[in-house]
Interface confidence: low
């Protein structure tokens, strides 16, 4: 038997990927482990090999199909098992009956770009990636802007309570370098969480016109 506490957490990206992290205190070393996905109403099943991400946690991605294919629905239940090899047998180490649309974490927004920049404001747009058409417009976003001399953790969060894939940042300082990030979350799902932050978009405001009062 393996001693210690085990935690097995998985999220569905709403299309064709389930990402899982398994952590185990006092876990087995040098043992091959995998996640096995067994849907209740689908003909397929899928496995992925758990790879170490720290001393006591492992992660893997269950690739269910083409990135934009809709592999699961709101009525699906997928039994997810952590299986570790013990000699010639596979031992169940952790298990959950996973409701994909209750455990959503979308991919980070992509294609961030500056639409228009001025001295004090900047209009930025982005796109969501691999998000299910089931959500329609039921998404929300958080954005943050990194100012010179500050950290991301200090940046105030701007909340967009609707599916709005653009923002107009205002009260910016002229001729200043900024970075911008955005993340997305569906409104659906009891255990749904925010996507990772997007890759930062760097931009610079225009300098103030000479002789003008700014």
């Amino acid at each position: 038997a393996v001693n210690g506490t085990s935690q097995f957490t998985c999220f569905y990206n709403s299309r064709a990927n389930i990402s899982c992290v398994w952590s185990q205190d006092g876990a087995l070393q040098d043992t091959s482990c995998q996640v096995h996905a067994w849907p209740d109403r689908r003909r397929w099943n899928q496995t992925c090999e758990l790879l170490p991400v720290s001393q006591a946690s492992w992660a893997c991605n269950l690739i269910l199909g083409a990135p934009d294919s809709q592999k699961l629905t709101t009525v699906d239940i997928v039994t997810l098992r952590v299986l570790c090899r013990e000699g010639v047998r596979w031992r169940v180490m952790a298990i959950q009956d996973f409701k994909p649309f209750e455990n959503l974490r979308l991919m980070a927004p992509i294609s961030l770009q500056v639409v228009h920049v001025e001295t004090h404001r900047c209009n930025i747009s982005w796109e969501i990636s691999q998000a299910s058409h089931y959500f329609e417009r039921h998404l929300e976003f958080e954005a943050r802007t990194l100012s010179p001399g500050h950290t991301w953790e200090e940046a105030p969060l701007l909340t967009l309570k609707q599916k709005q894939e653009w923002i107009c940042l205002e009260t910016l300082t002229p001729d200043t370098q900024y970075e911008f990030q955005v993340r997305v979350k569906p409104l659906q799902g009891e255990f749904t969480t925010w996507s990772p932050w997007s890759q930062p978009l760097a931009f610079r405001t225009k300098p103030a016109a000479l002789g003008k009062d700014t």
Epitope: A1, V2, S6, D40, I77, T79, R81, R89, W90, R91, V92, M93, A94, I95, Q96, D97
Partner: nanobody, 123 residues
Framework: QVQLVESGGGLVQAGGSLRLACALS????????MAWFRQAPGKGREFVAS????????DYVASVQGRFTVSRDNNKNTVYLQMNSLKPEDTAVYYC????????????????WGQGTQVTVSS
């Protein structure tokens, strides 16, 4: 060391009901597919019902299908066998079994066993 302890057996009249319970200790319960077997006097041990680790899939021998229901409570480390419409031919010692390999639960020699609980059905 894994231990299984059954309870709930007894004497019941034909047509009556009993609920057996089996508690697992010494390991993590959700690692195990659980099953019930029975052994009537002078006969071999036979498979009755099983439930997979998640509780989602159950399996029954034909003779108890529709009368017996196997279930589990992963928070209580316990598996149950609800027995309705009991018949005299259900009289046996009922054994709880556990196996971490859910493909092997019907295999008599690879399971961990409880000590058994007597069920007697009188006519």
């Amino acid at each position: 060391q894994v231990q299984l302890v059954e309870s709930g057996g007894g004497l019941v009249q034909a047509g009556g009901s009993l609920r057996l319970a089996c508690a697992l200790s010494g390991d993590v319960f959700v690692r195990y597919t659980m099953a019930w077997f029975r052994q009537a006097p002078g006969k071999g041990r036979e498979f009755v019902a099983s439930v997979t680790d998640s509780g989602r899939t159950t399996d029954y021998v034909a003779s108890v299908q529709g009368r017996f229901t196997v279930s589990r409570d992963n928070n209580k480390n316990t598996v149950y066998l609800q027995m309705n419409s009991l018949k005299p031919e259900d009289t046996a010692v009922y054994y709880c079994a556990a196996n971490t390999d859910y493909f092997q639960i019907r295999s008599l020699d690879r399971n961990t066993w409880g000590q058994g609980t007597q069920v007697t059905v009188s006519s």
